[in-house]
Interface confidence: low
């Protein structure tokens, strides 16, 4: 009897045979007839003759990727009644081998990606009554193979990405009632017919990224089960009101890298499963979007608009928000963010904010990062940060502060105050037990972190006159002990980098004289 595993292949006890990358020019012989999985990918098999696999009646998985295959005999795969997976990607096929695959009634997954396929014969997928996954991406298709796809009512995932498709006709996928995932990214799609997605009642993921769409794809209204929608990197300028009215289950929308100028105020309302919303550079938008019914947002980014105010009830409705980026707008007044308990990051840089009230950030018990830089802030209430127990990074640089409250900021790792030229008071190191990085308006304000404060270990200027860093021992004083352990850092020492440096020729003694 022939050996169970013929050289140069390797076999395991699970009836799997690996002959990949062995320089084979033909299907290997001498293998067990009971083989269930055969991997002959990455070889030099350029054609498959008739009955190439007649000795493998129990084959369930056949991998033929990366072989420069250009010809498959119509009867090359005959007899493979158990075959569930067939991978033919990265070959030289110019057409779908419709005859060869016709009898594969058990086939569930078919990979034809990364070939040179320009045509899909009308009868291509007839008889594939169990096919669930079909890869046709990275070929040279210029249109959706509408008729062949109509043979696949069991299909769950289809990718036609990375082709040269320029338009999609009405009812292109109408028979694919089981389809859950459809990838059409990286084509040249300029237009979608109004009814092109009709019949895709179970579609959950639609990827239209990297195409040439210049209008919002209204055809998505026919997709009631849609959860993930991508149309980033297109040429869409307007998202109309009611854009997603037919897609109440949307969880994710990727729309960045579109030249958006306008977004309908109610475009994103009633999307109760939406977790993330990113709108950048919609320069004609003046009002904060109506997010009524869209109550599970975890991340909201609205930047580069003309929005001048934030709704007072934002945090009554958006209790799940973790990150909020409202930078580069015209916001003047801030509401109380109380209620946004999960908020960890807020960016409000480059707005027109002038005042931070005591209640503005109250209740943000999870806030870690707050960026208020490049506003017009003149005053921050003394208790504004008092309850921000977790804040580690605070940027209030380039504002108009004359004083700066430190209550509640004991856990800061990074603080930026540079550019507040009316802020002349010295800071006390004991107020910042965990500080690693500090930027201040004036060099002398670094001195307290350079060796003046009793909390800090003196690091004399002989050691490193240029690099104004100081090593602070944890637990050096009772004050430090009160904030030690896990509410502080993992290391026993922390290096503080403070800018602007006083420099070698203007040490702290020179800047502060006898005060030191």
């Amino acid at each position: 009897a022939p050996p169970l595993c013929a050289a140069p292949c390797s076999c395991d006890g699970d009836r799997r045979v690996d002959c990949s990358g062995k320089g084979l020019t033909a299907v290997p012989e001498g293998l067990s007839a009971f083989t269930q999985a055969l991997d002959i990918s990455m070889n030099n098999i350029t054609q498959l003759p008739e009955d190439a696999f007649k000795n493998f009646p129990f084959l369930e998985e056949l991998q033929l990727a990366g072989n420069d295959l250009s010809f498959i005999h119509p009867k090359a795969l005959s007899g493979l009644k158990e075959l569930k997976v067939l991978t033919l990607q990265n070959n030289q096929l110019k057409t779908v081998p419709s005859e060869a695959i016709r009898g594969l009634s058990a086939l569930q997954s078919l990979r034809l990606d990364a070939n040179h396929i320009t045509s899909v014969p009308e009868d291509s997928f007839e008889g594939l009554v169990q096919l669930r996954h079909l890869w046709l991406d990275d070929n040279i298709l210029t249109e959706v193979p509408v008729r062949p796809l109509s043979n696949l009512p069991t299909l769950q995932a289809l990718t036609l990405a990375l082709n040269n498709i320029s338009s999609i006709p009405d009812f292109a996928f109408t028979n694919l009632s089981s389809l859950v995932v459809l990838h059409l990214h990286n084509n040249k799609i300029k237009s979608l017919s109004q009814h092109c997605f009709d019949g895709l009642d179970n579609l959950e993921t639609l990827d239209l990224n990297y195409n040439n769409l210049d209008e919002f794809p209204q055809a998505i209204k026919a997709l009631p089960s849609l959860k993930e929608l991508g149309f980033h990197s297109n040429s869409i300028s307007v998202i109309p009101d009611g854009a997603f009215a037919g897609n109440p289950l949307l969880r994710t929308i990727h729309l960045y890298d579109n030249p958006l100028s306008f977004v309908g105020n109610s475009a994103f309302h009633n999307l109760s499963d939406l977790h993330s919303l990113v709108i950048r550079g919609a320069s004609l938008v003046q009002w904060f979007p109506n997010l009524a019914g869209t109550v599970h947002l975890e991340s909201l980014t609205l930047t580069g608009t003309k929005i001048s105010s934030i709704p007072d009830d934002l945090c009554q409705n958006q209790k799940m928000l973790r990150t909020l980026d409202l930078s580069y707008n015209d916001i003047r007044d801030l509401p109380s963010f109380n209620g946004c308990r999960a908020l960890e990051e807020i960016s409000l840089q480059r707005n027109q904010i002038s005042l931070i009230k005591e209640t503005t950030f109250q209740g943000l018990t999870s806030l870690r990062i707050l960026d208020l830089s490049r506003n017009l802030i003149r005053e921050i209430h003394s208790g504004a940060f008092a309850k921000l127990g977790t804040i580690t990074n605070l940027d209030v640089s380039f504002n108009e502060l004359t004083s700066f409250p430190t209550e509640g900021l004991n856990g800061l790792n990074q603080l930026k105050l540079v550019g507040n030229f009316q802020l002349k008071d010295a800071l006390a190191a004991r107020d910042f037990a965990n500080l690693r990085s500090l930027s201040v308006p004036y060099a002398y304000q670094c001195c307290a972190f350079w060796g003046c404060d009793s909390y800090a270990n003196l690091n004399t200027e002989d050691n490193s006159p240029q690099d104004h860093s100081v090593t602070k021992e944890k637990g050096a004083t009772d004050a430090a002990n009160a904030t030690s352990t896990a509410e502080s850092e993992e290391h026993s020492q922390i290096i503080i980098h403070c800018t602007p440096s006083t420099g070698a020729f203007k040490p702290c003694e020179y800047l502060l004289g006898s005060w030191m």
Partner: antibody, heavy 119, light 106 residues
């Protein structure tokens, strides 16, 4: 040094209520969150919720809504948890723990209070 | 709720061994994870916070790593006093503890 001292073990009847105390010392009581954690015999840990003594703000794990109620007394630096409508499922050790933020790490723990519900 | 599955449930190792404990989340928890150990009859004790930060006073033989859904606690050289049940804890949303790994001496 920071300490969380919990009240003693309780033996209570089904249907009744019980109040467990957690007395804090060695730090500013109003500046940290007090969390409550449940551990049934031989089982893992389950987060019940927290109270911020500074303003009495609370948050509960949905599973314990209506079962647990937190209160904090600033004057005595004590946090209490009341458990209502007790059943055998509530028999467990209950821990209080301190954190600087609403959810993150618990650097200090009480020693635990055993509650036994039995008729 | 996010489920936290620890493996193995029970682990036997010898003094001096390098021990690896695993914690898998049912979804991405963005490194919002701590490790605790609990000795019999005692309260849990914090070892590692925010995935890889060693709590003050904890020996450096303990270290943590991970991202996304997969997290690991390593004890580089097991000591007798490390015998305990180890719990991971995620606070990315709706805080939950892991199922626990009981570490025993061989």
């Amino acid at each position: 040094q920071v300490q969380l001292q919990q009240s003693g073990a309780e033996l209570v009847k089904p249907g009744s209520s019980v109040k467990i105390s957690c007395k804090a010392s060695g730090y500013t009581f109003t500046s940290y969150f007090i969390h409550w954690i449940k551990q049934q015999p031989g089982n893992g840990l389950e987060w019940i919720g927290w109270i911020y003594p500074g303003d009495g703000d609370t948050e509960y794990n949905q599973k314990f809504n209506g079962k647990a109620t937190f209160i904090a007394d600033k004057s005595s630096s004590t946090a209490d948890m009341q458990l209502n409508s007790l059943t055998s499922e509530d028999s467990a050790v209950y821990f209080c723990a301190r954190s600087k933020s609403a959810y993150n790490w618990f650097a200090y723990w009480g020693q635990g209070t055993l509650v036994t519900v039995s008729s | 709720d996010i489920q936290m599955t620890q493996s193995p449930p029970v682990l036997s190792a010898s003094v001096g061994d390098r021990v690896t404990l695993s914690c898998k989340a049912s979804q991405n928890i963005n490194k919002n994870l701590d490790w605790y150990h609990q000795k019999h009859g005692e309260a849990p004790k914090l070892l590692i916070y925010y995935t890889n930060n060693l709590q003050t006073g904890i020996p450096s033989r303990f270290s943590g790593s991970g991202s996304g859904t997969d997290y690991t606690l390593i004890i580089s050289s097991l000591q007798p006093e490390d015998v305990a049940t180890y719990y991971c804890y995620q606070y990315n949303s709706g805080p939950t503890f892991g199922t626990g790994t009981k570490l025993e001496l061989k």
